[in-house]
């Protein structure tokens, strides 16, 4: 139920990568505006994105307070120019989002290979530890800070002259792999959270190859 010229939001969807979290919904408003509320299961509702004509609301600041909590959001619809108006049940029309637990559900962003260094037949490959918007003691935490050993990186590496991809894994941000002397190798990494059943993997990092800028070679 609601006012005659107001429609409820629908298709409420969480879009979240490395904890940057936006709630999206439909429809594009015609003569109406929206306000979003967010709450943990046991907490109070907090209003965000007041009387907006957007169909998205950035809720990052709220969810980063505790990424292991489960959140619920709701989107209220109001007639444009008459936001005090309520539905026939005495309150504005609203729609609930699905539940969202950032720690379990945020997508893993595309990782970046920070550097690689060859020493003889060993190559050390370092993955950039991306900063998130999660804070602790007024400091932004990295992805590794947040996920700890739950976060694995898989390295795919291959000789420039061949197609078969070998793999290595680490629960730090560094790999030390054996390579054949005199061969050039290419590298790509993928972030993985093996304990998850959904959103387990990131997309692959851009490929980096030996003989390019990021690398360093020492005998």
């Amino acid at each position: 139920s609601g006012t005659t010229n107001t429609v409820a939001a629908y298709n409420l969807t969480w879009k979240s990568t490395n904890f940057k979290t936006i709630l999206e919904w439909e429809p594009k408003p015609v003569n109406q505006v929206y306000t979003v509320q967010i709450s943990t299961k046991s907490g109070d509702w907090k209003s965000k994105c007041f009387y907006t004509t957007d169909t998205e609301c950035d809720l990052t600041d709220e969810i980063v307070k505790d990424v292991k909590q489960t959140y619920l959001a709701r989107v209220f619809s109001y007639p444009a120019g008459n936001v005090e108006s309520t539905g026939s049940a005495g309150e504005p029309l609203y729609e609930n989002s699905p539940e969202f637990t950032p720690y379990l559900e945020t997508n893993l962003g595309q990782p970046t290979i920070q550097s690689f260094e060859q020493v003889g037949t060993k190559v050390n490959v370092t993955v950039e530890d991306e900063r998130t918007l999660v804070r602790r003691n007024n400091t932004f935490l990295s992805l590794r800070d947040v996920f700890g050993k739950d976060l694995i990186y898989t390295l795919y590496y291959w000789k420039s002259s061949s197609s078969g991809k070998k793999t290595a894994k680490t629960n730090t941000n560094e790999f030390l792999i054996d390579v054949d002397k005199g061969e050039n190798y290419c590298f790509s990494v993928q972030a993985v959270i093996p304990s998850r059943t959904v959103n387990r993997k990131s997309t692959d990092s851009p490929v980096e190859c030996m003989g390019q800028e990021k690398g360093e070679f020492r005998e």
């Epitope: 991809k165 894994k169 993997k201």
Partner: antibody, heavy 120, light 107 residues
Framework: EVQLVESGGGLVQPGGSLRLSCAAS????????IHWVRQAPGKGLEWVGY????????YYADSVKGRFTISADTSKNTAYLQMNSLRAEDTAVYYC?????????????WGQGTLVTVSS | DIQMTQSPSSLSASVGDRVTITCRAS??????VAWYQQKPGKAPKLLIY???FLYSGVPSRFSGSRSGTDFTLTISSLQPEDFATYYC?????????FGQGTKVEIK
Amino acid sequence: EVQLVESGGGLVQPGGSLRLSCAASGFTIAYYIIHWVRQAPGKGLEWVGYIDPSNGYTYYADSVKGRFTISADTSKNTAYLQMNSLRAEDTAVYYCARDDQSLSSPFDYWGQGTLVTVSS
Amino acid sequence: DIQMTQSPSSLSASVGDRVTITCRASQDVNTAVAWYQQKPGKAPKLLIYSASFLYSGVPSRFSGSRSGTDFTLTISSLQPEDFATYYCQQHYTTPPTFGQGTKVEIK
């Protein structure tokens, strides 16, 4: 319930081809790595190759390199093993297995296997 | 490629016996070793992962340990359903490799 079901095995002549399928249910193959492992009659387990369905990356055992090709169709949640130029020594039960891509990457689920016999 | 040398290739034991199977890696594999049980005509089943972690649903009489590049599977008190072939496997580097297998038979 996680399940892997292989199919496509059978009798084939030396030099012939066969395509095995590994249909997955209860999980999404794009989130895992799929391996093929074979076992010749009365012998041990031999790793054949893997595919990461999320990017198509593969690697093969030397014994099958250039003859076997692993592919995946994420829309069908199925992995495939295309076997060409088959030899008598390729006779085996072929298993697909799921790799959870953790640090130690055990093969936590296996299919029931499908028998490939290469004989004239 | 890393070789996994498994011993013994077979052993005879009685119900209630303590059974130990070992695998030696040809180079460092950290703890990236798994153990599998296989019964005739069936697919292998995961028992132990990361050298010493018991897989979900596996009885606690099975245990795994590591000492350097040596890995051990122990069955503390052999049960009738444990007569099978056991394989170790390393997945530290590509290609993953299996041991030759140990057949545990009834004495």
